[in-house]
């Protein structure tokens, strides 16, 4: 039950996180005009990863896309790439995790397969979250650096724009959305990985082996072969971690919990 809850919660948290990453990537307010020196500005600038906008006090807003690819700074391209990779990994992770959910039955899917998928999606969410956090942090660092620069340009050649010296930029709402969303995706991924540990097959970690002792046909279930097999007594059929050891007549090999970690 706890495993299902952890997995379900991990999925929901990751879903919210990825939605946030997508929102942040699409938002125009990655950097906003710093109004410290001019709080009564008539024209307010803000910029995103894809376009820059101007909002007039008249209520009119105009946005212009960065219609150049080669003219954009490498840092901006890197941030775009990180965010897109984060979204793609997150989307794939979501797709995988839907099928991995314990509460959803798909044919005769083994628990081991669900455990595998849960771990895969968890790792994808973690990487996705890290990509988003990295992307937002790189952009934030770029803003901090440029904020204190005395030169006029912030993004040299960005979309053919020239920044005037009085226009300084500070953190926009998208950065905070991105950080929070990345964090949520990361947390969701960790929860999925934790849930995976409890999803391995509910089986005993040994098989019944027949031993033929001089004329008697008795089936022994060894419990005291600690030295030779690595197992201790498991009379209550508790789930234990095997070290990868298998009995000779085991036909199908199930990965243990340790195989995922």
């Amino acid at each position: 039950m706890a495993v299902t809850a952890c997995q379900g919660l991990g999925f929901v948290v990751s879903l919210i996180g990825i939605a946030g990453i997508i929102a942040a990537t699409c938002m125009d307010q990655w950097s906003t005009q710093d109004l410290y020196n001019n709080p009564v500005t008539a024209v307010f600038n803000y910029q995103g990863l894809w376009r820059s906008c101007v909002r007039e006090s008249s209520g009119f807003t105009e946005c212009r896309g960065y219609f150049t690819l080669l003219g954009l700074p490498a840092m901006l391209q890197a941030v775009r790439a990180l965010m897109i990779v984060g979204i793609v990994l997150g989307a794939i992770g979501l797709l995988v995790s839907i099928f991995a959910l314990k509460c959803i039955r798909i044919g005769s899917m083994e628990d081991s397969a669900k455990a595998n998928m849960t771990l895969t999606s968890g790792i994808m969410f973690i990487v996705s979250g890290l990509c988003a956090i990295a992307g937002v942090s790189v952009f934030a660092n770029m803003l901090v650096t440029n904020f204190w620069m005395s030169t006029a340009n912030m993004y040299t050649g960005m979309g053919g724009m020239v920044q005037t010296v009085q226009t300084r930029y500070t953190f926009g709402a998208a950065l905070f959305v991105g950080w929070v969303a990345g964090g949520l995706t990361l947390i969701g991924g960790v929860m999925m990985c934790i849930a995976c540990r409890g999803l391995a097959p509910e089986e005993t970690n040994y098989k019944a082996v027949s031993y033929h002792a001089s004329g008697h046909s008795v089936a022994y279930k060894p419990g005291g072969f600690k030295a030779s097999t690595g197992f201790g007594s498991n009379t209550k059929n508790k789930k234990i971690y095997d070290g990868g050891a298998r009995t000779e007549d085991e036909v199908q090999s199930y990965p243990s919990k340790h195989d995922y970690v």
């Epitope: 009564v40 600038n45 006090s57 105009e62 005037t164």
Partner: antibody, heavy 118, light 113 residues
Framework: EVQLLESGGGLVQPGGSLRLSCAAS????????MSWVRQAPGKGLEWVAT????????YYADSVKGRFTISRDNSKNTLYLQMNSLRAEDTAVYYC???????????WGQGTLVTVSS | DIVMTQSPDSLAVSLGERVTMNCKSS????????????LSWYQQKPGQPPKLLFY???TRESGVPDRFSGSGSGTDFTLTISSVQAEDVAVYYC?????????FGQGTKLEIK
């Protein structure tokens, strides 16, 4: 047809108060930023105050700051300018204007004359 | 505050003549975000309220005859009337729309010889 009609002007003594009104019609008043601009007799234009669409932000010329208050009533499609502590230099024709793209004032009322004299 | 200076203060021209008036701002009116110059031109005929001619320095307001043209960027702007007509007699004002307080130039008075 867009129309802006100012009222409330008149003769007032220095230190007195006056409230100007501007009745707007022919457009969605609540969707536009509005301004007051004045023109002293035989002189040029002087921007007085601006109120943003929602009314949350107001801007004033230094010469009127603290004395004049711009406000709006979107339900009545009316713009106001409350003028307190009037001075002789406030004597002018006051125009109500509508701001559009580029912060330009595309429509102006006919103006109302405010005379501050003892 | 941005100071707007117009030149000349007045000019008298013959009908059909080309006329140019200038407006200079104390700081750039070019907005980096959209590459627009936040300057507008107004025409005020005697006894009438001003009428908008241009916004964003060169965007003609609807209904304005195409003999009028606006140009310039940064701090220097020009209003040109290619062929002056009798009805063009007025005072022309430029205005800073870039930042508050909005400021007007002192105006250029156009007369017919």
């Amino acid at each position: 047809e867009v129309q802006l009609l100012e009222s409330g002007g008149g003769l007032v003594q220095p230190g007195g108060s006056l409230r100007l009104s501007c009745a707007a019609s022919g457009f969605t008043f609540s969707s536009y930023t509005m301004s007051w601009v004045r023109q002293a007799p035989g002189k040029g234009l002087e921007w007085v105050a601006t109120i943003i669409i929602g009314g949350s932000y107001t801007y004033y010329a230094d010469s009127v700051k603290g004395r004049f208050t711009i406000s709006r009533d979107n339900s009545k499609n009316t713009l106001y300018l409350q003028m307190n502590s009037l001075r002789a230099e406030d004597t002018a024709v006051y125009y109500c204007t509508r701001l559009v793209k580029g912060q330009a004032m595309d429509y102006w009322g006919q103006g109302t004359l405010v005379t501050v004299s003892s | 505050d941005i100071v707007m200076t117009q030149s000349p203060d007045s000019l008298a021209v013959s009908l059909g003549e080309r006329v140019t008036m200038n407006c200079k701002s104390s700081q750039s009116l070019l907005q980096s975000g959209n590459q627009k110059n936040y300057l507008s031109w107004y025409q005020q005929k005697p006894g009438q309220p001003p009428k908008l001619l241009f916004y964003w320095a060169s965007t003609r307001e609807s209904g304005v005859p195409d003999r009028f043209s606006g140009s310039g960027s940064g701090t220097d702007f020009t209003l040109t009337i290619s062929s002056v007509q009798a009805e063009d007699v007025a005072v022309y004002y430029c205005q800073n729309d870039y930042s508050y307080p909005f400021t007007f130039g002192q105006g250029t008075k156009l007369e017919i010889k």
